[in-house]
């Protein structure tokens, strides 16, 4: 079952999935000046059996026949209106990611791919958060959010993460507004862009992908 909305946003933080549950869809988006080939897939789908999971379909982009100055928008699956976006990153694999049953790795980039990836997550998906550059976490350990189904509705758990400016000592941070502030994003954007710097995921985090080392939600 697809998650109804985006993972929660945390001020001065970004999120990333370490692996994608079967059923996850990734839109085939092309960068400006390119489009999906006519017979090409709308999205890639994480599928598999008990022993192996992989992405079905391939995304392919071709040069647009006419120069298009507006951003190319790929049609989205009808069941899902919300957009989950992550900025393109070099693929990163925690130590035991491949051994996670029922999960796909980060798909490799395709030629002329858009700079943002739009995922449609499914129930049970876990995403990890970290503070953006220049900010530090007040909590220890991985901060994660899980898409859960409760009373027939999906919701993301709230991650335990508070990011504060490193330069601000012995006072409440935020007196000077750094670039990393969420103020910089239009209010209409509900998706969280992950920065191009790869997450530094400790082995401890990788080893606890399905079982957090601390409670993300108390209540």
């Amino acid at each position: 079952e697809l998650c109804d909305d985006d993972p929660p946003e945390i001020p001065h933080a970004t999120f990333k999935a370490m692996a994608y549950k079967e059923g996850t869809m990734l839109n085939c988006e092309c960068k400006r000046g390119f489009r999906r080939i006519k017979s090409g897939s709308l999205y890639m789908l994480c599928t598999g059996n008990s022993s192996h999971s992989s992405w079905d379909n391939q995304c392919q982009c071709t040069s647009s026949a006419t120069r298009n100055t507006t951003k190319q928008v790929t049609p989205q699956p009808e069941e899902q209106k919300e957009r989950k976006t992550t900025e393109m990153q070099s693929p990163m694999q925690p130590v035991d990611q491949a051994s996670l049953p029922g999960h796909c790795r980060e798909p490799p980039p395709w030629e002329n791919e858009a700079t943002e990836r739009i995922y449609h997550f499914v129930v049970g998906q876990m995403v990890y958060y970290q503070c953006v550059q220049g900010y530090r976490a007040l909590h220890r350990g991985p901060a994660e959010s899980v898409c859960k189904m409760t009373h027939g509705k999906t919701r993301w758990t709230q991650p335990q993460l508070i990011c504060t400016g490193e330069m601000e000592t012995s006072q409440f941070p935020g007196e000077e507004k750094p670039q990393a502030s969420p103020e910089g994003r239009p209010e209409s954007e509900t998706s969280c862009l992950v920065t191009t710097t790869d997450f530094q995921i400790q082995t401890e985090m990788a080893a606890t992908m399905e079982t957090s080392i601390f409670t993300t939600e108390y209540q």
Partner: antibody
Amino acid sequence: QVQLVESGGGVVQPGRSLRLSCAASGFTFSNHAMAWVRQAPGKGLEWVAVISYDGSNKYYADSVKGRFTISRDNSQNTLYLQMNSLRAEDTAVYYCTTGLNSGYDWGQGTLVTVSS
Amino acid sequence: DIQMTQSPSSLSASVGDRVTITCRASQSVSKFLNWYQQKPGKAPRRLIYGTNSLQSGVPSRFSGSGSGTDYTLTISSLQPEDFATYYCQQYNSWPWTFGQGTKLEIK
């Protein structure tokens, strides 16, 4: 079950000091940021101080900066608030809180009255 | 600091009424806004986080909306247990700040 129990409140004269404690249980105390929030009688809520999981980062409201010190003892699962040079306007119920991003768990509060 | 202003300061309503409380920030808080309920002698309880996400265990009659500087808490059908004081709180930038509160009383 998260439990936070504040103690140390009472009546104190202006200019004097008081130390509040908060005993925590039911969660991994050493992993989490903690905070003190206060509420003057019949008034609203105010964040007083916040401390990171390891005590390396401390943040204070302007109204208490230089007078109050937040600290923690992870081996004892205890949060502290050292309040010096107390003023009448510091009179409030002081709450210890955690779960700062997940709904907040609060203690029952301890009343501090600054009066001559 | 970001100032949070709630309106009205107090409100009389009856069981079954639909009630709306508004909160205005002195600058954009980018939807990083919580709503709390507090009853006399008790600690606050968070109802809504991130403008519109319902805290686990909170009845669905509570809902939140808004963006930029203007936010709203709506109780679709007041229940006897809903009479309390409600606070908004921004967590977009430190110091996190609360509104002054809205006292919801029985008419």
